[in-house]
């Protein structure tokens, strides 16, 4: 697989390829899940339509020491135009519900699959 921009990548792959690779990684996580993902860590739920990639990264970046989602975190950083650090959470997003990382990944995966089917790569 071509490495995604955001972690020592030589250049961005086409958006359709980038989205497909992110979907494949999320599928990987959900299929290989044996014990509770990231020890059942909780993250903020996000609006999956508004500025979704940065919002997803802001939520997941606060999970540390979970190797299962490290690649997803790196991939999402390539999808976000600004730098995101742990502890940052934009006022543009509502913080009202926390969900398990496993549920977050499933929700994100379902939404990305829908976007891919509809050809919304951007």
């Amino acid at each position: 697989l071509t490495c995604l921009g955001g972690f020592a990548s030589p250049g961005p792959v086409p958006p359709s390829t980038a989205l497909r690779e992110l979907i494949e990684e999320l599928v990987n996580i959900t299929q290989n899940q044996k014990a509770p993902l990231c020890n059942g860590s909780m993250v903020w739920s996000i609006n999956l339509t508004a500025g979704m990639y940065c919002a997803a990264l802001e939520s997941l970046i606060n999970v540390s020491g979970c190797s299962a989602i490290e690649k997803t975190q790196r991939m999402l950083s390539g999808f976000c135009p600004h730098k995101v650090s742990a502890g940052q959470f934009s006022s543009l997003h509502v913080r009202d519900t926390k969900i398990e990382v496993a549920q977050f990944v499933k929700d994100l995966l379902l939404h990305l699959k829908k976007l891919f089917r509809e050809g919304q790569f951007n």
């Epitope: 995604l4 955001g6 339509t49 950083s77 999808f79 919304q120």
Partner: antibody, heavy 118, light 109 residues
Framework: EVQLQQSGAEFVRPGALVKLSCKAS????????MYWVKQRPEQGLEWIGR????????IYDPKFQGKASITGDTSSNTAYLQLSSLTSEDTAVYYC???????????WGQGTTLTVSS | QAVVTQESALTTSPGETVTLTCRSS?????????ANWVQEKPDHLFTGLIG???NRAPGVPARFSGSLIGDKAALTITGAQTEDEAIYFC?????????FGGGTKLTVL
Amino acid sequence: EVQLQQSGAEFVRPGALVKLSCKASGFNIKDYYMYWVKQRPEQGLEWIGRIDPENGNTIYDPKFQGKASITGDTSSNTAYLQLSSLTSEDTAVYYCARYAYYGPFDYWGQGTTLTVSS
Amino acid sequence: QAVVTQESALTTSPGETVTLTCRSSIGTVTTNNYANWVQEKPDHLFTGLIGSTNNRAPGVPARFSGSLIGDKAALTITGAQTEDEAIYFCALWYSNHWVFGGGTKLTVL
């Protein structure tokens, strides 16, 4: 006060290599993505690429792959753009810009004029 | 690669409201394009105005606002002033790279 101070104008021969610098003051470059943008006379802006100075991770526009190399030095708070195998097509003004949290490209350098001519 | 299109030139009068738009060649502009608006004044003076569709940069006058109108991103200047005469560039983020529009030359007469 936030400032991006770019290196001076360059006049170089075709085939040469040049390294432009962008020294930041008033903030830490490791806290932001730093971008480079090209502007040719009477043309629009072209995005070259970005760097995360904290870890050196970069992304380039495919058009500039193999042509541009972006690096950063957090100790001197400086971002660099190296351009190789220069041709007349590389004659342009090059800008560095800071990208803020949720945008925009809020602070820009004053630009470095690069002229490639024999 | 996508092409981003802007009006090449617009003219307005002081006090009037003017809207500049930014169209994507590959469909509707959404919040996931993180639309940016940048102002260029003479002598290569660039200033970032709006990020992420409608996020105004600190210090930018409130008369500048960003939005989505129909399938495009838009920059509205409510009550234009003579000092707003400039070239305005929009930029759209396509998953992992930026594409700039050609710029709109705004004249305030």
